[in-house]
């Protein structure tokens, strides 16, 4: 065996048990939790990088990650893991999360072509104009989901199961 079957810390994982998904690509299978941006492929019996399947038809397993990957390639957009959606920074400048700081601050420096509501924000007509509060608070700390079936699950290194039958 080369390249597989080794845990990151060399020991057995605490998360090495049967779990049943309420939904998702693989249902009712022996599932091991994987590092972020990976998914458990039960037929291969190993964690696989989501990047390898983003271009395949069968990317449902990593749907959120793949959407996030394609979203990040688009300028002026970021992937909101809570909303599971690709958000245009232009639509939220003035009350934007850190992911949009570069885009929004550059936009605000050159007010040409800004929509009227953003020009008003710039001249102080709207309160909380750069307050990173509300629904976006803390979003920048979210990682990609370990599995679409377990939304928001983030695993510590010693929970990463690379232990195989």
């Amino acid at each position: 065996m080369s390249g597989l079957g080794r845990s990151r810390r060399g020991g057995r994982s605490r998360v090495d048990q049967e779990e049943r998904f309420p939904q998702g690509l693989w249902t009712g299978v022996a599932m091991r939790s994987c590092p972020e941006e990976q998914y458990w492929d039960p037929l291969l019996g190993t964690c696989m990088s989501c990047k390898t399947i983003c271009n395949h038809q069968s990317q449902r397993t990593c749907a959120a990650f793949c959407r996030s990957l394609s979203c990040r390639k688009e300028q002026g957009k970021f992937y909101d893991h809570l909303l599971r959606d690709c958000i245009s920074c232009a639509s939220i400048c003035g009350q934007h999360p850190k992911q949009c700081a570069y885009f929004c601050e550059n936009k605000l420096r050159s007010p040409v072509n800004l929509p009227p509501e953003l020009r008003r924000q710039r001249s102080g007509e709207v309160e909380n104009n750069s307050d990173n509060s509300g629904r976006y608070q803390g979003l920048e700390h979210r990682g990609s989901e370990a599995s679409p079936a377990l939304p928001g699950l983030k695993l510590s290194a010693d929970q990463v199961a690379l232990v195989y039958s």
Partner: antibody, heavy 118, light 107 residues
Amino acid sequence: QVQLVQSGAEVKKPGASVKVSCKASGYTFTNYVMHWVRQAPGQRLEWMGYILPYNDGTKYSQKFQGRVTITRDTSASTAYMELSSLRSEDTAVYYCARYDWEGSFDYWGQGTTVTVSS
Amino acid sequence: DIQMTQSPSSLSASVGDRVTITCAASQDISNYLNWYQQKPGKAVKLLMRYTSRLHSGVPSRFSGSGSGTDFTLTISSLQPEDFATYYCQQGNRFPPTFGGGTKLEIK
């Protein structure tokens, strides 16, 4: 179109080794896992092992562990399966098969007959 | 390992017949059941994945059904090119395992 072309038939003596090749075309070789499956005369298809597309990681069936080695040559888009310490019960047709990421094997090689006989 | 049991092991039928082959898994595999066709000296072909999804280029006379442990492959009207051996395979748990095959012969 996707094609997997395997090397020709082999006749080997017990105790020898055999190395079967599988040349892939029509897709990006490094984007898919390659599996090896064999079928002995009158028997069902039997999974042997696979090689991962991006880091040469392999996983083998317990039955063949220690006797089988799966490798690949990315530049030649070719996967290899070597089986050592051959015995008569290893007489079979050996297939390479591409994994489709959804639990099935969507394209197969034409098969390589390996005969082990003294 | 999950055991896959196919029946019948052989079947004689005529062109135009409707034929059903069954496959039983030793434990729940959800819908991760695939069907393959094998002809002597030819590459194995994927017919159906995920119980009922036809692989590209497979004619619509092939259909699949089932869930959990019991599955069927149906050929609605047999054509001369359909006489072959058919295998089921579970794709829900490592390692992948295959049924014993059903040989479909001309009556």
